[in-house]
Interface confidence: medium
Protein backbone atom coordinates (compact mmCIF):
# COMPACT_ATOMS: atom_id res chain seq x y z
CA UNK A 1 0.00 0.00 0.00
CA UNK A 2 1.04 3.59 -0.62
CA UNK A 3 2.63 5.86 1.94
CA UNK A 4 0.48 8.95 2.40
CA UNK A 5 1.75 12.52 2.23
CA UNK A 6 -0.30 15.63 2.85
CA UNK A 7 -0.16 19.24 1.70
CA UNK A 8 -2.46 22.22 1.67
CA UNK A 9 -3.64 24.03 -1.45
CA UNK A 10 -1.05 26.67 -2.37
CA UNK A 11 1.78 24.98 -0.52
CA UNK A 12 4.60 22.93 -2.00
CA UNK A 13 4.20 19.18 -1.72
CA UNK A 14 7.22 16.97 -1.09
CA UNK A 15 7.30 13.32 -2.12
CA UNK A 16 10.50 11.61 -0.96
CA UNK A 17 12.36 9.12 -3.11
CA UNK A 18 16.00 8.13 -2.77
CA UNK A 19 18.46 5.61 -4.08
CA UNK A 20 22.17 5.03 -3.61
CA UNK A 21 24.12 5.14 -6.87
CA UNK A 22 26.07 1.90 -7.35
CA UNK A 23 29.18 4.04 -7.58
CA UNK A 24 29.30 7.78 -6.93
CA UNK A 25 28.17 9.59 -10.02
CA UNK A 26 26.88 6.44 -11.73
CA UNK A 27 23.32 7.64 -11.99
CA UNK A 28 20.32 5.46 -12.66
CA UNK A 29 17.46 6.79 -14.79
CA UNK A 30 14.43 7.75 -12.72
CA UNK A 31 10.91 8.64 -13.74
CA UNK A 32 8.06 10.22 -11.79
CA UNK A 33 4.53 9.71 -12.98
CA UNK A 34 0.99 10.48 -11.89
CA UNK A 35 -0.80 7.24 -11.08
CA UNK A 36 0.37 3.97 -9.60
CA UNK A 37 3.51 2.41 -11.05
CA UNK A 38 2.65 0.26 -14.07
CA UNK A 39 4.60 -2.86 -15.09
CA UNK A 40 7.10 -0.79 -17.07
CA UNK A 41 8.07 2.87 -17.12
CA UNK A 42 5.81 5.55 -15.51
CA UNK A 43 2.34 6.55 -16.58
CA UNK A 44 1.67 10.26 -17.15
CA UNK A 45 5.34 11.18 -16.75
CA UNK A 46 5.91 14.51 -15.00
CA UNK A 47 9.70 14.29 -14.66
CA UNK A 48 12.51 12.08 -15.88
CA UNK A 49 16.26 11.83 -15.31
CA UNK A 50 18.90 9.98 -17.28
CA UNK A 51 22.44 8.91 -16.38
CA UNK A 52 23.52 12.54 -16.18
CA UNK A 53 20.76 15.14 -15.97
CA UNK A 54 17.09 15.80 -15.59
CA UNK A 55 16.06 15.51 -19.22
CA UNK A 56 12.31 16.06 -18.98
CA UNK A 57 10.10 17.92 -16.57
CA UNK A 58 6.77 19.68 -16.57
CA UNK A 59 5.81 22.97 -14.98
CA UNK A 60 5.65 22.95 -11.17
CA UNK A 61 7.53 19.65 -10.80
CA UNK A 62 11.08 19.87 -9.51
CA UNK A 63 13.91 17.88 -8.01
CA UNK A 64 15.13 20.32 -5.40
CA UNK A 65 17.63 17.94 -3.85
CA UNK A 66 20.90 16.79 -5.37
CA UNK A 67 19.66 14.14 -7.75
CA UNK A 68 23.25 13.26 -8.63
CA UNK A 69 23.64 11.87 -5.13
CA UNK A 70 20.47 9.82 -5.40
CA UNK A 71 18.00 12.30 -3.92
CA UNK A 72 15.22 12.21 -6.50
CA UNK A 73 12.50 13.48 -4.18
CA UNK A 74 9.79 15.33 -6.08
CA UNK A 75 8.61 18.81 -5.18
CA UNK A 76 5.29 19.97 -6.60
CA UNK A 77 4.93 23.75 -6.39
CA UNK A 78 1.71 25.52 -5.45
CA UNK A 79 -0.40 22.40 -5.28
CA UNK A 80 -4.06 22.31 -6.26
CA UNK A 81 -6.76 19.88 -5.23
CA UNK A 82 -6.37 18.10 -8.58
CA UNK A 83 -2.79 17.19 -7.63
CA UNK A 84 -4.20 14.67 -5.16
CA UNK A 85 -3.61 11.06 -6.05
CA UNK A 86 -0.96 8.41 -6.31
CA UNK A 87 2.49 9.19 -7.71
CA UNK A 88 5.03 6.67 -8.90
CA UNK A 89 8.76 7.04 -8.35
CA UNK A 90 10.56 4.45 -10.45
CA UNK A 91 14.29 3.86 -10.13
CA UNK A 92 15.13 2.26 -13.46
CA UNK A 93 17.95 -0.06 -12.46
CA UNK A 94 19.49 -1.79 -15.51
CA UNK A 95 18.44 -5.38 -16.07
CA UNK A 96 15.18 -7.24 -16.43
CA UNK A 97 12.58 -6.42 -13.76
CA UNK A 98 15.19 -4.75 -11.55
CA UNK A 99 13.32 -1.49 -11.18
CA UNK A 100 12.57 -0.14 -7.71
CA UNK A 101 8.97 1.12 -7.62
CA UNK A 102 7.47 3.38 -5.00
CA UNK A 103 3.84 4.45 -4.91
CA UNK A 104 3.23 7.59 -2.86
CA UNK A 105 -0.22 8.92 -2.10
CA UNK A 106 -0.60 12.69 -2.06
CA UNK A 107 -3.60 14.15 -0.25
CA UNK A 108 -4.30 17.83 -0.84
CA UNK A 109 -6.42 19.67 1.69
CA UNK A 110 -8.23 22.93 0.90
CA UNK A 111 -6.51 26.08 2.08
CA UNK A 112 -7.80 27.43 5.37
CA UNK A 113 -9.55 30.71 4.65
CA UNK A 114 -11.65 31.90 7.58
CA UNK A 115 -15.08 33.01 6.37
CA UNK A 116 -15.95 36.60 7.28
CA UNK A 117 -19.00 37.22 9.50
CA UNK A 118 -22.15 37.57 7.40
CA UNK A 119 -23.75 40.98 7.12
CA UNK A 120 -27.44 41.73 7.69
CA UNK A 121 -28.43 41.40 4.08
CA UNK A 122 -27.20 37.84 3.72
CA UNK A 123 -27.69 36.82 0.12
CA UNK A 124 -25.42 33.78 0.05
CA UNK A 125 -24.37 32.57 -3.36
CA UNK A 126 -22.24 29.50 -3.66
CA UNK A 127 -20.08 30.06 -6.67
CA UNK A 128 -16.83 28.21 -7.29
CA UNK A 129 -13.83 30.45 -7.41
CA UNK A 130 -10.60 29.56 -9.10
CA UNK A 131 -7.41 31.11 -7.84
CA UNK A 132 -4.53 30.86 -10.24
CA UNK A 133 -1.05 32.23 -10.18
CA UNK A 134 0.70 33.04 -13.37
CA UNK A 135 4.44 32.69 -13.09
CA UNK A 136 6.62 34.65 -15.42
CA UNK A 137 7.80 31.84 -17.66
CA UNK A 138 5.66 30.59 -20.52
CA UNK A 139 5.17 27.19 -18.97
CA UNK A 140 4.50 28.33 -15.47
CA UNK A 141 0.80 29.03 -15.27
CA UNK A 142 -0.51 27.21 -12.26
CA UNK A 143 -3.92 26.79 -10.73
CA UNK A 144 -3.68 27.07 -7.00
CA UNK A 145 -7.09 25.80 -6.06
CA UNK A 146 -10.54 26.76 -4.91
CA UNK A 147 -11.42 29.18 -2.19
CA UNK A 148 -14.37 28.31 0.02
CA UNK A 149 -17.68 29.91 -0.96
CA UNK A 150 -18.25 33.38 0.38
CA UNK A 151 -21.18 35.74 0.44
CA UNK A 152 -21.52 38.45 -2.17
CA UNK A 153 -21.51 40.85 0.75
CA UNK A 154 -18.07 39.65 1.69
CA UNK A 155 -16.22 40.27 -1.55
CA UNK A 156 -14.78 43.52 -0.25
CA UNK A 157 -13.17 41.61 2.60
CA UNK A 158 -11.52 39.10 0.29
CA UNK A 159 -8.17 40.85 0.40
CA UNK A 160 -8.13 40.74 4.18
CA UNK A 161 -9.07 37.09 4.16
CA UNK A 162 -6.28 36.40 1.69
CA UNK A 163 -3.82 38.30 3.82
CA UNK A 164 -4.67 36.14 6.80
CA UNK A 165 -4.31 32.85 4.99
CA UNK A 166 -1.18 30.84 4.51
CA UNK A 167 -1.96 30.84 0.83
CA UNK A 168 -1.68 34.61 0.71
CA UNK A 169 1.73 34.45 2.31
CA UNK A 170 2.85 32.02 -0.37
CA UNK A 171 1.45 34.30 -3.04
CA UNK A 172 3.03 37.41 -1.62
CA UNK A 173 6.36 35.69 -1.24
CA UNK A 174 6.40 34.49 -4.79
CA UNK A 175 5.20 37.85 -6.10
CA UNK A 176 2.75 35.94 -8.22
CA UNK A 177 -0.01 37.42 -10.32
CA UNK A 178 -3.39 36.23 -9.16
CA UNK A 179 -6.42 35.74 -11.30
CA UNK A 180 -9.79 35.29 -9.70
CA UNK A 181 -12.58 34.14 -11.95
CA UNK A 182 -16.07 34.12 -10.46
CA UNK A 183 -18.54 31.69 -11.95
CA UNK A 184 -22.16 32.05 -10.85
CA UNK A 185 -24.18 28.84 -11.03
CA UNK A 186 -27.21 29.25 -13.24
CA UNK A 187 -29.61 27.48 -10.94
CA UNK A 188 -28.51 29.43 -7.86
CA UNK A 189 -28.72 32.70 -9.75
CA UNK A 190 -32.17 31.83 -11.05
CA UNK A 191 -33.35 31.07 -7.54
CA UNK A 192 -31.72 34.17 -6.18
CA UNK A 193 -33.26 36.30 -8.94
CA UNK A 194 -36.73 34.91 -8.25
CA UNK A 195 -36.32 35.55 -4.53
CA UNK A 196 -35.17 39.10 -5.20
CA UNK A 197 -38.03 39.78 -7.63
CA UNK A 198 -40.52 38.35 -5.17
CA UNK A 199 -39.01 40.47 -2.40
CA UNK A 200 -39.09 43.54 -4.60
CA UNK A 201 -42.75 42.98 -5.46
CA UNK A 202 -43.68 42.66 -1.79
CA UNK A 203 -41.65 45.75 -1.02
CA UNK A 204 -43.38 47.61 -3.87
CA UNK A 205 -46.78 46.45 -2.65
CA UNK A 206 -46.05 47.78 0.83
CA UNK A 207 -44.36 51.02 -0.11
CA UNK A 208 -46.56 52.17 -3.04
CA UNK A 209 -43.61 54.23 -4.06
CA UNK A 210 -41.47 53.97 -7.20
CA UNK A 211 -38.77 56.05 -5.60
CA UNK A 212 -38.23 53.52 -2.87
CA UNK A 213 -37.87 50.78 -5.44
CA UNK A 214 -35.22 52.79 -7.25
CA UNK A 215 -33.31 53.29 -4.03
CA UNK A 216 -33.40 49.64 -3.14
CA UNK A 217 -29.91 48.21 -2.83
CA UNK A 218 -30.07 44.96 -4.72
CA UNK A 219 -26.83 43.76 -3.26
CA UNK A 220 -24.75 45.55 -0.68
CA UNK A 221 -21.09 45.44 -1.56
CA UNK A 222 -19.33 47.41 1.10
CA UNK A 223 -16.44 49.63 0.03
CA UNK A 224 -16.75 48.82 -3.66
CA UNK A 225 -17.43 51.53 -6.24
CA UNK A 226 -21.05 51.48 -7.43
CA UNK A 227 -19.96 51.07 -11.04
CA UNK A 228 -17.77 48.11 -10.13
CA UNK A 229 -18.39 44.57 -9.08
CA UNK A 230 -21.79 45.21 -7.51
CA UNK A 231 -23.27 46.45 -10.76
CA UNK A 232 -21.59 43.67 -12.70
CA UNK A 233 -23.10 41.03 -10.44
CA UNK A 234 -26.47 42.80 -10.31
CA UNK A 235 -26.56 43.02 -14.11
CA UNK A 236 -25.69 39.36 -14.24
CA UNK A 237 -28.57 38.47 -11.97
CA UNK A 238 -30.95 40.49 -14.16
CA UNK A 239 -29.63 38.92 -17.36
CA UNK A 240 -31.78 36.62 -19.43
CA UNK A 241 -29.70 33.50 -18.87
CA UNK A 242 -29.09 34.31 -15.22
CA UNK A 243 -25.45 33.51 -15.91
CA UNK A 244 -22.62 35.95 -15.69
CA UNK A 245 -18.93 35.28 -15.88
CA UNK A 246 -16.39 37.77 -14.74
CA UNK A 247 -13.57 36.62 -16.93
CA UNK A 248 -10.72 38.88 -16.05
CA UNK A 249 -10.66 39.45 -12.34
CA UNK A 250 -7.00 40.06 -11.75
CA UNK A 251 -5.46 40.58 -8.36
CA UNK A 252 -1.98 41.73 -9.06
CA UNK A 253 0.32 41.41 -6.09
CA UNK A 254 2.92 43.99 -6.93
CA UNK A 255 3.87 45.03 -3.45
CA UNK A 256 3.50 43.07 -0.22
CA UNK A 257 0.83 45.40 1.11
CA UNK A 258 -1.43 46.00 -1.86
CA UNK A 259 -3.87 43.96 -3.86
CA UNK A 260 -5.25 45.36 -7.10
CA UNK A 261 -8.22 43.99 -8.89
CA UNK A 262 -9.56 44.82 -12.30
CA UNK A 263 -12.97 43.61 -13.25
CA UNK A 264 -13.85 43.59 -16.89
CA UNK A 265 -16.77 42.12 -18.76
CA UNK A 266 -16.64 39.79 -21.73
CA UNK A 267 -16.72 42.77 -24.06
CA UNK A 268 -13.40 44.06 -22.64
CA UNK A 269 -14.32 47.73 -22.18
CA UNK A 270 -11.58 50.22 -22.83
CA UNK A 271 -11.69 51.33 -19.22
CA UNK A 272 -11.84 48.28 -16.96
CA UNK A 273 -14.10 48.47 -13.97
CA UNK A 274 -11.81 48.69 -11.03
CA UNK A 275 -11.37 48.07 -7.38
CA UNK A 276 -8.29 48.47 -5.31
CA UNK A 277 -7.75 46.83 -1.99
CA UNK A 278 -5.05 48.51 0.06
CA UNK A 279 -3.69 46.28 2.76
CA UNK A 280 -3.06 47.94 6.11
Amino acid sequence: SEVEYRAEVGQNAYLPCFYTPAAPGNLVPVCWGKGACPVFECGNVVLRTDERDVNYWTSRYWLNGDFRKGDVSLTIENVILADSGIYCCRIQIPGIMNDEKFNLKLVIKPAKVTPAPTLQRDFTAAFPRMLTTRGHGPAETQTLGSLPDINLTQISTLANELRDSRLANDLRDSGATIRIGIYIGAGICAGLALALIFGALIFKWYSHSKEKIQNLSLISLANLPPSGLANAVAEGIRSEENIYTIEENVYEVEEPNEYYCYVSSRQQPSQPLGCRFAMP
Epitope: P21, A23, G25, N26, L27, W62, R68, G137
Partner: antibody, heavy 121, light 107 residues
Framework: EVQLVESGGGLVQPGGSLRLSCAAS????????IHWVRQAPGKGLEWVGD????????DYADSVKDRFTISADTSKNTAYLQMNSLRAEDTAVYYC??????????????WGQGTLVTVSS | DIQMTQSPSSLSASVGDRVTITCRAS??????VAWYQQKPGKAPKLLIY???FLYSGVPSRFSGSRSGTDFTLTISSLQPEDFATYYC?????????FGQGTKVEIK
Protein backbone atom coordinates in the same frame (compact mmCIF):
# COMPACT_ATOMS: atom_id res chain seq x y z
CA GLU B 1 37.53 22.68 3.16
CA VAL B 2 36.54 22.53 -0.49
CA GLN B 3 39.34 23.55 -2.83
CA LEU B 4 40.07 23.39 -6.54
CA VAL B 5 43.61 23.96 -7.82
CA GLU B 6 44.41 24.30 -11.51
CA SER B 7 47.83 23.73 -12.99
CA GLY B 8 49.47 23.14 -16.36
CA GLY B 9 49.04 26.55 -17.96
CA GLY B 10 51.74 28.28 -19.92
CA LEU B 11 52.89 29.58 -23.28
CA VAL B 12 52.22 27.41 -26.31
CA GLN B 13 52.48 27.92 -30.04
CA PRO B 14 49.40 27.89 -32.32
CA GLY B 15 48.56 24.29 -33.24
CA GLY B 16 50.21 23.05 -30.07
CA SER B 17 48.78 21.11 -27.14
CA LEU B 18 48.52 21.60 -23.40
CA ARG B 19 46.97 19.61 -20.55
CA LEU B 20 45.45 21.37 -17.60
CA SER B 21 44.76 19.68 -14.28
CA CYS B 22 42.17 20.50 -11.67
CA ALA B 23 42.93 18.87 -8.34
CA ALA B 24 39.98 18.78 -5.95
CA SER B 25 40.04 18.43 -2.20
CA UNK B 26 37.35 18.52 0.46
CA UNK B 27 34.82 16.69 -1.71
CA UNK B 28 34.59 13.71 -4.03
CA UNK B 29 34.50 14.74 -7.68
CA UNK B 30 32.63 11.51 -8.51
CA UNK B 31 29.52 12.97 -6.91
CA UNK B 32 29.67 16.23 -8.81
CA UNK B 33 30.05 17.82 -12.20
CA ILE B 34 33.29 19.64 -12.88
CA HIS B 35 33.08 22.54 -15.32
CA TRP B 36 35.82 24.35 -17.18
CA VAL B 37 35.32 28.08 -17.77
CA ARG B 38 37.73 30.44 -19.45
CA GLN B 39 38.24 34.19 -19.51
CA ALA B 40 40.20 35.93 -22.24
CA PRO B 41 42.24 38.93 -21.05
CA GLY B 42 39.90 41.83 -20.30
CA LYS B 43 36.88 39.83 -21.46
CA GLY B 44 33.95 37.99 -19.94
CA LEU B 45 33.46 34.40 -18.87
CA GLU B 46 32.96 31.58 -21.36
CA TRP B 47 31.95 28.02 -20.54
CA VAL B 48 34.27 25.47 -22.14
CA GLY B 49 32.82 22.14 -21.10
CA ASP B 50 32.13 19.80 -18.22
CA UNK B 51 32.45 16.26 -17.01
CA UNK B 52 30.54 14.08 -14.64
CA UNK B 53 33.51 12.07 -13.41
CA UNK B 54 31.49 9.25 -11.83
CA UNK B 55 29.74 8.42 -15.09
CA UNK B 56 32.36 9.87 -17.41
CA UNK B 57 29.90 11.81 -19.56
CA UNK B 58 31.13 15.08 -21.02
CA ASP B 59 29.76 18.16 -22.77
CA TYR B 60 31.59 20.85 -24.77
CA ALA B 61 31.12 24.32 -26.17
CA ASP B 62 30.98 24.38 -29.97
CA SER B 63 34.10 26.54 -30.09
CA VAL B 64 36.27 23.78 -28.58
CA LYS B 65 34.47 20.62 -29.71
CA ASP B 66 36.80 18.10 -31.40
CA ARG B 67 39.83 20.00 -30.13
CA PHE B 68 39.46 19.83 -26.34
CA THR B 69 38.86 16.71 -24.25
CA ILE B 70 37.78 16.64 -20.61
CA SER B 71 38.60 13.61 -18.51
CA ALA B 72 38.91 12.69 -14.85
CA ASP B 73 40.82 10.35 -12.60
CA THR B 74 38.54 9.68 -9.65
CA SER B 75 41.30 7.89 -7.72
CA LYS B 76 43.29 11.14 -7.80
CA ASN B 77 40.16 13.29 -7.42
CA THR B 78 41.39 15.29 -10.40
CA ALA B 79 39.81 16.51 -13.62
CA TYR B 80 41.77 17.30 -16.78
CA LEU B 81 41.38 19.51 -19.81
CA GLN B 82 43.38 18.29 -22.79
CA MET B 83 43.70 21.10 -25.34
CA ASN B 84 44.85 20.30 -28.86
CA SER B 85 45.13 22.39 -32.04
CA LEU B 86 45.34 25.52 -29.95
CA ARG B 87 44.57 28.90 -31.53
CA ALA B 88 45.36 32.46 -30.55
CA GLU B 89 41.72 32.94 -29.50
CA ASP B 90 42.13 30.18 -26.90
CA THR B 91 44.38 32.50 -24.91
CA ALA B 92 42.69 32.92 -21.55
CA VAL B 93 42.72 32.16 -17.86
CA TYR B 94 41.17 28.71 -17.45
CA TYR B 95 39.15 27.96 -14.34
CA CYS B 96 37.68 24.72 -13.14
CA UNK B 97 34.53 24.96 -11.04
CA UNK B 98 32.28 22.61 -9.16
CA UNK B 99 28.65 22.29 -10.17
CA UNK B 100 26.19 23.12 -7.42
CA UNK B 101 22.82 21.48 -8.03
CA UNK B 102 19.58 23.18 -7.18
CA UNK B 103 16.33 22.69 -9.04
CA UNK B 104 18.02 20.33 -11.44
CA UNK B 105 20.58 22.80 -12.79
CA UNK B 106 24.19 23.62 -11.98
CA UNK B 107 25.57 26.91 -10.88
CA UNK B 108 29.24 27.00 -9.87
CA UNK B 109 29.85 27.28 -6.15
CA UNK B 110 33.60 26.65 -5.92
CA TRP B 111 36.19 27.83 -8.40
CA GLY B 112 39.89 27.28 -8.74
CA GLN B 113 42.30 30.20 -8.81
CA GLY B 114 42.74 29.84 -12.58
CA THR B 115 45.71 29.07 -14.80
CA LEU B 116 46.80 31.25 -17.72
CA VAL B 117 47.16 29.72 -21.16
CA THR B 118 48.83 31.89 -23.77
CA VAL B 119 48.78 30.79 -27.40
CA SER B 120 51.28 32.79 -29.37
CA SER B 121 54.05 32.33 -31.86
CA ASP C 1 22.60 29.36 -27.82
CA ILE C 2 20.79 31.52 -25.30
CA GLN C 3 22.13 35.10 -25.16
CA MET C 4 22.31 36.87 -21.83
CA THR C 5 22.28 40.64 -22.35
CA GLN C 6 23.56 42.41 -19.28
CA SER C 7 23.18 46.11 -18.54
CA PRO C 8 24.71 48.47 -17.82
CA SER C 9 28.21 47.44 -18.87
CA SER C 10 29.59 49.70 -16.15
CA LEU C 11 28.31 52.03 -13.48
CA SER C 12 29.72 54.41 -10.92
CA ALA C 13 28.25 54.43 -7.45
CA SER C 14 29.05 55.52 -3.92
CA VAL C 15 29.16 53.53 -0.72
CA GLY C 16 25.61 53.19 0.62
CA ASP C 17 23.99 53.45 -2.82
CA ARG C 18 21.40 51.01 -4.04
CA VAL C 19 22.68 49.33 -7.19
CA THR C 20 20.64 47.38 -9.72
CA ILE C 21 22.07 45.27 -12.54
CA THR C 22 19.81 43.59 -15.07
CA CYS C 23 20.19 40.65 -17.38
CA ARG C 24 17.81 39.67 -20.17
CA ALA C 25 17.70 36.15 -21.58
CA SER C 26 16.99 35.75 -25.29
CA UNK C 27 14.51 32.99 -24.47
CA UNK C 28 12.89 31.34 -21.49
CA UNK C 29 15.39 30.08 -18.93
CA UNK C 30 12.90 29.48 -16.12
CA UNK C 31 14.71 30.32 -12.86
CA UNK C 32 18.04 28.86 -13.96
CA VAL C 33 20.09 32.04 -13.58
CA ALA C 34 23.05 32.63 -11.31
CA TRP C 35 24.96 35.79 -10.42
CA TYR C 36 28.70 35.95 -9.77
CA GLN C 37 31.06 38.57 -8.41
CA GLN C 38 34.60 38.79 -9.71
CA LYS C 39 37.45 40.97 -8.50
CA PRO C 40 40.57 41.65 -10.59
CA GLY C 41 42.93 38.68 -10.67
CA LYS C 42 40.51 36.48 -8.74
CA ALA C 43 38.08 33.74 -9.59
CA PRO C 44 34.36 34.51 -9.69
CA LYS C 45 32.26 33.92 -6.56
CA LEU C 46 28.69 32.65 -6.56
CA LEU C 47 26.22 35.16 -5.09
CA ILE C 48 22.76 34.13 -6.25
CA TYR C 49 21.52 30.84 -7.68
CA UNK C 50 18.18 29.86 -9.19
CA UNK C 51 17.42 33.55 -9.85
CA UNK C 52 16.66 34.57 -6.27
CA PHE C 53 18.37 32.27 -3.78
CA LEU C 54 21.19 33.77 -1.77
CA TYR C 55 24.19 31.47 -1.68
CA SER C 56 25.54 30.45 1.71
CA GLY C 57 27.77 33.10 3.29
CA VAL C 58 26.75 35.89 0.91
CA PRO C 59 25.65 39.10 2.68
CA SER C 60 21.91 39.74 2.68
CA ARG C 61 22.34 43.10 0.94
CA PHE C 62 22.57 41.07 -2.27
CA SER C 63 19.30 39.88 -3.75
CA GLY C 64 18.08 38.50 -7.03
CA SER C 65 14.71 38.60 -8.73
CA ARG C 66 13.05 37.53 -11.92
CA SER C 67 10.38 38.98 -14.17
CA GLY C 68 9.84 36.79 -17.21
CA THR C 69 13.16 36.64 -19.01
CA ASP C 70 14.50 39.68 -17.13
CA PHE C 71 16.70 39.03 -14.12
CA THR C 72 17.91 41.59 -11.62
CA LEU C 73 20.74 41.65 -9.12
CA THR C 74 20.29 44.30 -6.44
CA ILE C 75 22.80 45.49 -3.89
CA SER C 76 20.69 47.34 -1.33
CA SER C 77 23.54 49.32 0.22
CA LEU C 78 26.84 49.24 -1.61
CA GLN C 79 29.88 48.47 0.57
CA PRO C 80 33.55 49.18 -0.25
CA GLU C 81 34.18 45.46 -0.85
CA ASP C 82 31.39 45.30 -3.42
CA PHE C 83 33.27 47.20 -6.10
CA ALA C 84 33.86 44.46 -8.66
CA THR C 85 32.53 43.02 -11.90
CA TYR C 86 29.26 41.10 -11.81
CA TYR C 87 28.17 38.40 -14.24
CA CYS C 88 24.85 36.70 -14.79
CA UNK C 89 24.73 33.19 -16.17
CA UNK C 90 21.96 30.97 -17.47
CA UNK C 91 22.37 27.27 -16.78
CA UNK C 92 19.03 26.18 -18.18
CA UNK C 93 20.38 24.75 -21.41
CA UNK C 94 23.74 23.62 -22.73
CA UNK C 95 25.86 25.54 -23.37
CA UNK C 96 25.55 27.65 -20.23
CA UNK C 97 26.11 31.27 -21.18
CA PHE C 98 27.21 34.38 -19.30
CA GLY C 99 26.32 38.01 -19.59
CA GLN C 100 29.13 40.32 -20.70
CA GLY C 101 29.59 41.67 -17.17
CA THR C 102 28.87 44.87 -15.29
CA LYS C 103 31.76 46.72 -13.71
CA VAL C 104 30.76 48.57 -10.54
CA GLU C 105 33.23 51.39 -9.90
CA ILE C 106 33.64 53.98 -7.17
CA LYS C 107 32.11 57.34 -8.03
Amino acid sequence: EVQLVESGGGLVQPGGSLRLSCAASGFNISNNVIHWVRQAPGKGLEWVGDIMPGGGSTDYADSVKDRFTISADTSKNTAYLQMNSLRAEDTAVYYCARGYVYRMWDSYDYWGQGTLVTVSS
Amino acid sequence: DIQMTQSPSSLSASVGDRVTITCRASQDVNTAVAWYQQKPGKAPKLLIYSASFLYSGVPSRFSGSRSGTDFTLTISSLQPEDFATYYCQQHYTTPPTFGQGTKVEIK
